[in-house]
């Protein structure tokens, strides 16, 4: 609500103001009456039976001070012209309100020409005979405003033109937007402007321990003509370590924290933190617990995970499938990833070294989220040790590692990959391949083939190369073909059995 600063209050003055009447001794008259058992003063006039009335009542000179626009509140009563005998033909039911600005008090020197009319004042309710007799004062309240005022002071004047009117209260005031705390900003008491459409912009200052948030607007309010604050812009927020309590920022209690300027309250220190002092912006982690750089301060402190719980390495020829289960202790985090590293050892020499360059993983071996991976292109008759390390967001903050290892010996080469290169009615041309690292260990390749459905007889061809043509075959017949590498240490893993069909005599020309 707007704050009113009173410049003139006739009702409160108890008849002591001594306003000027013109003409002197006629028209307006100061009188006392009793209302609600209290004496009240009023200026009244009731020359309704005589025409051409021009009775003036002028206030004392009122110092303007800092007011720009003044508000004039009038409380008055007007008698019904019909309540007089014959309706009092010259009777009126309105009066006029005037003002004049001046830099000095003219005293009893009254000049009508200096006054500017503000408005004609008409009652909402007139006092009829029955009200008058019963002493029911039909009080009207009218308010007008004038501005901008520029001189040191002013007068008000009331012109009677033949009404029966009593002025019970004349209150002149200006409006201020009151001192205000809003949005944790303090706005000073501000004089309301004089122009109705315009709003005075007032900058606010953040209360103690409050700040304008980064990228936020400075707090501003607009003081309207009627003394009301309008259109708040921007705000202040309690800084880190402080929370809003009513219109102030209060330090977080011990055991609580607030890590940034925000609207949120202080939060209780999360798990695995040490008790915080008053006004804390964060809570330190217990020993052995950590916070990753991207972790919010509200998150509990965490630690690195334990090692993967259970690790198996299953060899399949020249491939190994590694499987493991998540760590039993996640460290309180969900961002666990796994890294797989490989080491190979030569049985003859016992020499070992990393093998990342020579093996192939089914997916990149670092930052794995799944709990299995297949490693292929392993060399036969080699010992491999695989290490699976579990890591989370805080693993980088400690030197220790959480891992489990599994070893496996590769006794066979990987099965060759077989392709049909060509065929005729009596022959099949077949080729194969094995990973280059394993080729040096192969002495010869053994190709076994037989007619499909004939389990009693089969044929074997050996070759050092990577292809062979099988001749003397029956036309339009399906053959089962398998290729196996032979090494100094024995047989490698056989390929899968392929079904290849020779051409029929009719289709041989195609």
């Amino acid at each position: 609500q707007g704050k009113e600063v009173v410049l003139l209050d006739f009702a409160a003055a108890g008849g002591e103001l001594g306003w000027l009447t013109h003409p002197y001794g006629k028209g307006w008259d100061l009188m006392q009456n009793i209302m609600n058992d209290m004496p009240i003063y009023m200026y009244s006039v009731c020359n309704v039976m005589s025409g051409d009335q021009d009775n003036w009542l002028r206030t004392n000179w009122v110092y303007r001070g800092e007011a720009e626009r003044i508000f004039i509140e009038l409380k008055f009563t007007v008698r019904d012209c019909n309540s007089f005998p014959g309706g009092a033909s010259s009777c009126k039911e309105t009066f006029n309100l005037y003002y004049a600005e001046s830099d000095l008090d003219y005293g009893t020197n009254f000049q009508k020409r200096l006054f500017t009319k503000i408005d004609t004042i008409a009652p909402d309710e007139i006092t009829v005979s029955s009200d008058f007799e019963a002493r029911h004062v039909k009080l009207n309240v009218e308010e007008r405003s004038v501005g901008p005022l520029t001189r040191k002071g002013f007068y008000l004047a009331f012109q009677d033109i033949g009404a029966c009117v009593a002025l019970l209260s004349v209150r002149v005031y200006y409006k201020k937007c009151p001192e205000l705390l809003q949005g944790l900003a303090h706005f000073p008491e501000t004089i309301a402007g004089s122009d109705a459409p315009s709003l005075a912009t007032v900058a606010g200052t953040c209360v103690d321990h409050a700040v304008v948030p980064p990228g936020g607007e400075e707090p501003r309010m607009h003081c309207a003509v009627d003394g009301e604050w309008l259109v708040p812009i921007g705000q202040c927020l309690c800084q880190a370590g402080y929370e809003k309590v009513e219109d102030a920022c209060q330090a977080c209690s011990p055991g609580f924290f607030k890590f940034e300027a925000s609207e949120s309250p202080c939060l209780e220190c999360p798990e695995h933190t040490l008790p915080s002092p008053e006004g804390a912006t964060s809570c330190e982690c217990e020993e052995g617990f950590f916070r990753a750089p991207q972790d919010p301060a509200s998150m509990p402190c965490t630690r690195p995970p334990s090692a993967p719980h259970y690790l198996t390495a299953v060899g399949m020829g020249a491939k190994v499938e590694l499987r493991w289960t998540p760590p039993q202790d996640s460290g309180g985090r969900e961002d666990i990833v796994y890294s797989v590293t490989c080491e190979q050892c030569w049985p003859e020499s016992g020499e070992c070294g990393p093998c990342e360059a020579s093996v192939r993983y089914s997916e990149p071996p670092h930052g794995l989220t799944r709990t299995s991976v297949t490693v292929s292109d392993l060399e036969p008759h080699m010992n491999y040790t695989f290490t699976v390390e579990a890591r989370n967001g805080v693993s980088g903050l400690v030197t220790s590692r959480s891992f489990r290892t599994a070893s496996v010996s590769i006794n066979q080469t990987e099965p060759p990959k077989v392709r049909l290169e060509g065929r005729s009615t009596t022959s099949l041309s077949v080729s194969w391949s094995i990973p280059p690292p394993q080729q040096s260990r192969v002495w010869k390749y053994e190709v076994t083939y037989r007619k499909k459905g004939d389990s009693n007889s089969y044929n074997v061809r050996r070759t050092e190369g990577f292809s062979v043509t099988l001749d003397d075959l029956a036309p339009d017949t399906t053959y089962l073909v398998q290729v196996q590498a032979l090494t100094q240490e024995g047989q490698g893993a056989g390929s899968k059995v392929h079904e290849f069909q020779t051409l029929s005599p009719e289709g041989s020309g195609n």
Partner: antibody
């Protein structure tokens, strides 16, 4: 022309009763506040009682409160004063008086009334 | 009750004289005062109300003034018809008290 004519006065013994009447004419009786004012021989005027235009409110001087009753009959344009438990000090000429707010050229009514029209009076003598 | 004191209690004057009668209230009555004229054997007649307002039909040689506790009735240019007793009455309270009158006699 406004006329007020009192009647009902006379000689009465102390403790006795009397009813005064005031017949009104020449004006709208129901618009007027009416009152009784008395004047003891060689003494000041003394207000006795008043009644509003519609029959209320009524007021009494302390000296007659509880003994006198003012009333009116607007249909008969008549004002009454019932006087009981009369005393010697009630001996006086009793005037009927009227007030019409329409002739009171003031913006706010006074705390009480004055009297614009008066009757010729009727003498009440209380004596044993 | 409010006491009303008139002075003088009687005065002698000649036709054409200016006569002033005063009335004092025992406490402030603002301007709630009326003046009446009464001739022997007749009813009182209203002259002035609200201290200075002339009642309808009353000659303008009668005037009233004052406020608070001091009031006066002035007859400027006394006429033969004006020889009578004059009463003041306050109506600031329900007791509506009268003064005891000032008798204006022919000198």
């Amino acid at each position: 022309e406004v006329q007020l004519l009192e009647s009902g006065g006379g000689l009465v013994q102390p403790g006795g009763s009397l009813r005064l009447s005031c017949a009104a004419s020449g004006f709208t009786f129901s618009h007027y506040m009416m009152a009784w004012v008395r004047q003891a021989p060689g003494k000041c005027l003394e207000w006795v009682s008043r009644i509003g235009p519609s029959g209320g409110p009524t007021h009494y001087a302390d000296s007659v409160k509880g003994r006198f009753t003012i009333s009116r009959d607007n249909s008969k344009n008549t004002l009454y004063l019932q006087m009981n438990s009369l005393r010697a000090e009630d001996t006086a000429v009793y005037y009927c008086a009227g007030y019409d707010s329409g002739y009171d050229y003031v913006a706010v009514a006074g705390p009480a009334e004055y009297f614009q029209h008066w009757g010729q009076g009727t003498l009440v003598t209380v004596s044993s | 009750d409010i006491q009303m004191t008139q002075s003088p209690s009687s005065l002698s004057a000649s036709v054409g004289d200016r006569v002033t009668i005063t009335c004092r209230a025992s406490q402030s009555i603002s301007t709630w005062l009326a003046w009446y004229q009464q001739k022997p054997g007749k009813a009182p007649k209203l002259l002035i109300y609200k201290a200075s307002n002339l009642h309808t039909g009353v000659p303008s040689r009668f005037s009233g003034s004052g406020s608070g506790t001091e009031f006066s009735l002035t007859i400027s240019g006394l006429q033969p018809d004006d020889f009578a007793t004059y009463y003041c009455q306050q109506y600031n309270s329900y007791s509506r008290t009268f003064g005891c009158g000032t008798k204006v006699e022919i000198k």
